[in-house]
């Protein structure tokens, strides 16, 4: 005996007034032919003919899930009693965007919760949000197919000056966060060491304030602040940066001992541990992973290892004593 067995017993469903045996029979005992599954769906217990009272289960193809009541029941009149059921996509398809925009990461399908970043060539910014997240079967916020790149006002204003500055006659002066930043500029996630807090700021405002000698402001990453590894690393990197001997300006960012400024993207990219040069007197005594032994590493090695999200405990600054 199995509780799951179905011998076509007449049942009363919650929303039915009559038992199936009480329904008028049109063609007795003929059963039902195979029903048509919804688009992107299939019948799990597939066969040519089904008995009266028998259920079929609707399943969905990989990348889709059932929405609604997924069982059809064979009625005595040879038809199927079926509720509204459909197979909805559980992944997002790579959006179709204008050729000028670059999608990162570039995949065919994205799982729920995965995000993409849209970027433009140097000197241009996305004319709208740059970060989108796959939710259900669509992107949030919705991606407009007219979305394009626009000339970066920061680039226009700055002339031959550095980011955050503008041309005033023959000299460069800091932009005013209030007066010069009314236009749209891409969002950045920024950390303020004074308030020990991070927040989303328009790029123009961040650069203008940084130019006005706001040394407590640190760039974390492009896009609005969102919990996750990128934010986590941004904060840890800021803490490590105070001991860095190298501070190289790079786009919105400043690169430190364990990083290289990518010429093509104007972003700081972590080196890999073997790329670290031995020089430097910024040493740390650390414990790696689950190892009990101590090791002396330089700041570059510490930065690259933490950037790679490898487990490491900093015991103290300076050489290990043993």
């Amino acid at each position: 005996f199995s509780i799951m067995e179905n011998n076509g017993q007449p049942c009363i469903n919650d929303d039915e007034e009559m038992k199936e045996v009480d329904l008028p029979e049109i063609e007795a005992d003929s059963g039902c032919p195979q029903p048509v599954p919804p688009e992107n769906g299939f019948i799990r217990n597939e066969k040519q003919l089904y008995l009266v009272g028998e259920d079929v289960e609707i399943s969905c193809l990989t990348g889709f899930e059932t929405v609604g009541y997924q069982y059809f029941r064979c009625l005595p009149d040879g038809t199927w009693r079926q509720g509204d059921v459909e197979c909805q996509r559980t992944e997002c398809i790579k959006p179709v965007v204008q050729e000028v925009l670059t999608i990162t990461p570039f995949q065919r399908l994205y799982r729920i919760g995965e995000s993409i970043e849209l970027t433009c060539p140097k000197g241009f910014v996305v004319a709208g949000p740059s970060r989108y997240t796959c939710q259900g079967n669509s992107w949030t916020p919705p991606i407009s197919n007219s979305l394009t790149c626009e000339k970066d006002t920061l680039t226009k204003l700055k002339g031959h000056c550095q980011l955050g500055q503008k041309q005033s006659g023959s000299e460069c002066i800091c932009m005013s966060p209030e007066e010069d930043c009314s236009h749209h500029s891409e969002d950045l996630c920024v950390f303020d060491t004074d308030s020990n807090d991070y927040f989303t700021s328009p790029a123009c405002k961040f650069l203008a304030e940084k130019c006005l000698n706001n040394q407590q402001l640190h760039f974390l990453h492009i896009g609005s602040c969102q919990d996750g590894r990128q934010l986590e690393w941004g904060l840890e990197r800021t803490r490590l940066s105070s001991n860095s001997t190298k501070k190289e300006s790079c786009g919105y960012d400043t690169c430190y001992d364990w990083e290289k400024c990518s010429a093509s993207t104007s972003k700081c990219v972590c080196l890999l541990p073997p790329q670290c040069f031995k020089g430097g007197n910024q040493l740390y005594c650390v414990k790696m992973g689950s190892s009990t032994s101590e090791k002396t590493l330089n700041i570059c090695e510490v930065g690259t290892i933490r950037c790679a999200n490898r487990k490491m405990e900093i015991l103290h600054p300076g050489k290990c004593l043993a």
Partner: antibody
Framework: EVQLVESGGGLVQPGGSLRLSCVAS????????MAWVRQAPGKGLEWVAT????????YYRESVKGRFTISRDNAKNTLYLQMDSLRAEDTAVYYC???????????WGQGTLVTVSS | DIVLTQTPLSLSATPGQSVSISCRSS???????????LYWYLQRPGQSPQLLIY???DLGSGVPDRFSGSGSGTDFTLKISRVEAEDVGVYYC?????????FGAGTNLEIK
């Protein structure tokens, strides 16, 4: 100018041993991690092992772990690869490589051929 | 291990022509802090490999700007805008986003 010169390759029987050397010049050898990369005849490239500045940390590809040992002598500006229990599939040209801030394998030696055959 | 699949395995070009080589990874090379460690090397006949492109699109020191790299996630491309006779050899992509570091099987470029 960075120069890396490998030596020590040759013909060896399966199960045999060989020790490769790589003499470095044109830079401060002890300031850099070093690596060995190999290339089987007519095949692609394969990372073999990496060593840190003073030899206190070493890293190997799975297939050579326990058989190969990477080491260095900073006083002699020399990198070594001790290869034991050699197999036919270890037959390759072995390159010694140095990293830079651009890449893990930015500078390469000319390579030394190791043939494992009976 | 990450598998890098290069296409085509060989190609022939005339001087001045543009060519592209594709490198597809079995897994995304974008790490969780937004870095992608993808490199391109050229191995000329009888020589050691030489770095062309690092971090997907940055040009190696002394490499002519006829070479360019692009891509993200799992799909990467090396483009040579005006092929020259000296570009002959085998082109390899390499990833260092995941241990162990792995190389593609190579693409052999011949000049007609």
């Amino acid at each position: 100018e960075v120069q890396l010169v490998e030596s020590g390759g040759g013909l060896v029987q399966p199960g045999g041993s060989l020790r490769l050397s790589c003499v470095a010049s044109g830079f401060t050898f002890s300031d850099y991690y070093m690596a060995w990369v190999r290339q089987a005849p007519g095949k692609g490239l394969e990372w073999v092992a990496t060593i840190n500045y003073d030899g206190s940390s070493t890293y190997y590809r799975e297939s050579v772990k326990g058989r190969f040992t990477i080491s260095r002598d900073n006083a002699k500006n020399t990198l070594y690869l001790q290869m034991d229990s050699l197999r036919a599939e270890d037959t390759a040209v072995y390159y010694c490589a140095r990293p830079s801030t651009e890449a893990l394998f930015a500078y390469w030696g000319q390579g030394t051929l190791v043939t494992v055959s009976s | 291990d990450i598998v890098l699949t290069q296409t085509p395995l060989s190609l022939s070009a005339t001087p001045g022509q543009s060519v592209s080589i594709s490198c597809r990874s079995s897994q995304s090379l974008l790490n969780d802090v937004g870095n992608t460690y993808l490199y391109w090397y050229l191995q000329r006949p009888g020589q050691s490999p030489q770095l062309l492109i690092y971090l997907v699109s940055d040009l190696g020191s002394g490499v002519p700007d006829r070479f360019s790299g692009s891509g993200s996630g799992t799909d990467f491309t090396l483009k040579i805008s005006r092929v020259e006779a000296e570009d002959v050899g085998v082109y390899y992509c390499m990833q260092a986003s995941h241990a162990p570091y792995t190389f593609g099987a190579g693409t052999n470029l011949e000049i007609k």
